[in-house]
Amino acid sequence: YFGKLESKLSIIRNLNDQVLFIDQGNRPLFEDMTDSDCRDNAPRTIFIINMYKDSQPRGMAVAISVKCEKISTLSCENRIISFKEMNPPDNIKDTKSDIIFFQRSVPGHDNKMQFESSSYEGYFLACEKERDLYKLILKKKDELGDRSIMFTVQNED
């Protein structure tokens, strides 16, 4: 069971300092951006991190949304990352959800975050290069020190 708490506005970066944004095709991508680029591309660079109370404490449960014309929420349905046009619900009556991730700091590094899927144990949000694009994907990972599954989250509130 997940119950919605507060939310915060954040900029998410990979460890190469590339900024996460949602492109015109609703794809989550990473790109090099200056601070002014980041501001100019808002709201596509501003993510709403919705925190949830978890009936089985497993880390900070979050849903990640973005508000462009409408609110879209990050989902990992069938292990594929996409933004679905939906508001994060107030309550989720299950211990797993395709839109809930556990945000945890990397041990010894409070500023580096990992996001593990609540639906798929051992699967993490990751940045992966595909041709010329740096994509946000869901990746099964058993080397947890890999930088591709680490991110920084800068609060904008």
């Epitope: 497993r58 880390g59 945890r104 041990p107 058993d142 020190g145 890999d146």
Partner: antibody
């Protein structure tokens, strides 16, 4: 309690191949991997590689990648490690082990080698 | 590859002594470090995971500490059954690498 039971000792000639098996008995959750570790007589532990039973993807240590093949038969819960072009330096005890997530009190994941096979002695001698 | 430098290579101590074994990683391994004990002719057994978390059933005289690149296994009051070999393992990145091992002997 998970147990790993390995095949028996083998004596091989240089240049030959050996295939060691590792059968899981007991209840094991999903989301584990099989790793193989070897230990030459009187020496330390050396990681050889791993296989993911979910998709058969493998990762091998650089020094073994041209000679080792790790496979898994999900229907029998058995993992295999085949090492080819054997030489005398490959004389060692070969262990299979499971690589599984353990969690701390905040749910943070850590992978550990928790269950180990009894080891299989492979002797390479002419 | 991440190198794990373990020291000492051997140690001889008396029952009741405090024994410390260290592992130094060549880069930050984010506490993704486990410690194993191995008795002669047996497979290794997990003692500590996540640098400082005691595996179920392991006596509380064993403890682990460290972060970043420096890690320590401590046996607070040595017992006769603690004789054996001890290894650290970094699980941060492939290839996984073990320390060279420490042979612990009871005087």
């Amino acid at each position: 309690q998970v147990q790993l039971v390995q095949s028996g000792a083998e004596v091989k000639k240089p240049g030959a191949s050996v295939k060691v098996s590792c059968k899981v008995s007991g209840e094991i959750s999903t989301g584990y991997y099989f790793h193989w570790v070897r230990q030459a007589p009187g020496k330390g532990l050396e990681w050889m590689g791993r296989i993911d039973p979910e998709d058969d993807s493998t990762k091998y240590a650089e020094r073994f990648k041209d000679r080792v093949t790790m496979t898994e038969d999900t229907s029998t819960d058995t993992a295999y490690m085949e090492l080819s072009s054997l030489r005398s330096e490959d004389t060692a005890v070969y262990y299979c082990t499971t690589w599984r997530i353990y969690r701390d009190s905040s749910g943070r994941p850590f992978y550990v080698m928790d269950a180990w096979g009894q080891g299989t002695l492979v002797t390479v001698s002419s | 590859d991440i190198q794990m430098t373990q020291s000492p290579s051997s140690v001889s101590a008396s029952v009741g002594d405090r024994v410390t074994i260290t592992c130094l990683a060549s880069e930050d391994i984010y506490t993704y470090l486990t410690w194993y004990q191995q008795k002669p002719g047996k497979a290794p057994q997990l003692l500590i995971y996540g640098a400082n978390k005691l595996q179920d059933g392991v006596p509380s005289r064993f403890s682990g500490s460290g972060s970043g690149t420096d890690y320590t296994l401590t046996i607070s009051s040595l017992q006769p059954e603690d004789e054996g070999d001890y290894y650290c393992l970094q699980g941060s990145k492939f290839p996984l690498t073990f320390g060279q091992g420490t042979k612990l002997e009871i005087k």
